[in-house]
């Protein structure tokens, strides 16, 4: 807290300028008008104030706006934003994407701070949903943002926003998050032609059901093994040998290297050995010829 003292004669600041860096903390408090500061916030960034001086300026704004700063001030906070606490930010009503970008720019290159996380949450809640422009902005600054949202929060992402998602934005997502995102991506990209559609949908396929994988197998997509290994095991198990062969195309040979790993391992156990032999890859572990295959899940449901 800065003590209240009268401003010395001739030191009253007519505007926010470089001369203020020579003011002591008590002089800034006494001689800078808070309303003037608010209207000339854009100038603060260009002046090399010390951290202690910035504390005084923040204190003046806090006194002027005890209920929270208006967006006209927030947009021009610049480095003063780093002085804000999450509690300060919870009082704000930020609606402009330009304001959000300006403040994210201040924090650029640093890990997401509690202040930034609070700002983003306030902004997204204020908008009601993660629209495409917001998602575009957030993933540009923080590629892992999407994967830190819960499946419930992701359910509020409109399909149109999926166009903003890049493959690297999904790198750290878990299967339940992809379960939510995949149907949205399918809807977003539904009007694209076969090969273009596959390029776009590929990163989301960890959430795809069996019927969609079967449909893809009819489209000559040549899925690579890395994508295949990320598919849901329960979605892969019902696929026939012929369907997997069509789905992978020339990449089918990669199954041999992955035969001990999920979902390939579990899929092999479900196939007839003579069907596996048709691939000519030496895959072992299928159901021996002549054995009867019982659907135990069906049997359990009946008993």
């Amino acid at each position: 807290e800065v003590e209240k003292t009268a401003c010395p004669s001739g030191k009253k600041a007519p505007e926010i300028d470089e001369s203020l860096i020579f003011y002591k903390k008590w002089e800034l408090e006494a001689c800078v008008d808070a309303a003037l500061l608010a209207t000339q916030m854009d100038r603060v960034n260009a002046i090399p104030f010390t951290y202690e001086q910035l504390d005084v300026l923040k204190h003046k704004l806090d006194e002027l706006y005890p209920q929270g700063y208006p967006e006209s001030v927030i947009q021009h906070l610049g480095y003063l934003f780093l002085k804000m606490s999450p509690e300060d930010i919870r009082k704000w009503n930020v609606t402009s994407l330009e304001t959000l970008k300006a403040l994210l720019e201040v924090n650029k290159g640093h890990e997401m701070s509690p202040q930034v996380a609070t700002l983003i949450d306030r902004f997204v809640k204020g908008r009601g949903q993660l629209d495409k422009d917001t998602l575009d902005t957030l993933t540009a600054f923080y590629p892992g943002y999407l994967c830190s949202l819960s499946p419930e929060e992701l359910s509020s992402v409109p399909p149109s926003s999926i166009w903003a998602v890049r493959p690297q934005d999904l790198d750290t997502c878990d299967p339940r998050q992809l379960d939510v995102l995949y149907p949205k991506a399918r809807l977003a990209f539904q009007n694209m032609n076969g090969s273009e559609y596959f390029v776009k949908i590929q990163s989301f396929l960890g959430g795809a059901p069996t019927e969609d994988l079967k449909a893809l197998s009819q489209q000559n997509v040549s899925m690579d093994l890395a994508t295949f290994m990320k598919l849901r095991t329960d979605a892969v198990l019902p696929l026939t040998v012929a369907e997997v062969q069509k789905l992978l195309g020339p990449h089918v040979e990669g199954l041999k290297a992955e035969e001990r790993h999920r979902p390939v391992r579990d899929w092999i156990l479900r196939q007839r050995q003579d069907d596996l032999d048709t691939l000519g890859l030496g895959l072992q572990g299928g159901i021996p010829n002549g054995y009867l295959v019982l659907d135990l899940s069906m049997q359990e449901a009946l008993s």
């Epitope: 997401m112 892992g144 949202l149 819960s150 419930e152 929060e153 790198d171 998050q177």
Partner: nanobody, 115 residues
């Protein structure tokens, strides 16, 4: 830089219960998805469960009714309660944090289920 340190690994009887802990080095994060994964010998890393900043959680089908994830914010600890353990649960267990948009991994702790 956030650090994760797992503990609680060891030998457990089949059918028994066990709890793993993961100490999180900072407490100031706001948005997160904390997860447990495991990796059995010669197998790929497998996702087990996640807990998110809105308090919700999600589970892989293989552990849905047996494992429970929880987070003690006051102690900065992530837990994995494992019940009805089977020999096929033998693996190195890793905690993972997607915290404020960055991903971090612990070094892992070995759990062996055998009589």
């Amino acid at each position: 830089q956030l650090q994760l340190v797992e503990s609680g690994g060891g030998l457990v009887q089949p059918g028994g219960s066990h709890r793993l802990s993961c100490a999180v080095s900072v407490s100031t994060f706001t948005r997160y998805a904390m997860r447990w994964y495991r990796q059995a010998p010669g197998k790929e890393r497998e996702w087990l469960t996640s807990i998110y900043s809105d308090g919700s959680s999600a589970y892989a089908d293989s552990v849905k009714d047996r494992f429970t994830i929880s987070l003690d914010n006051a102690k900065n600890m992530l837990y994995l309660q494992m019940n009805s353990l089977k020999p096929e649960d033998t693996a190195v267990y890793y905690c993972n944090a997607n915290v404020d948009s960055k991903a971090y991994w612990g070094q892992g702790t070995q759990v062996t289920v055998a009589s």
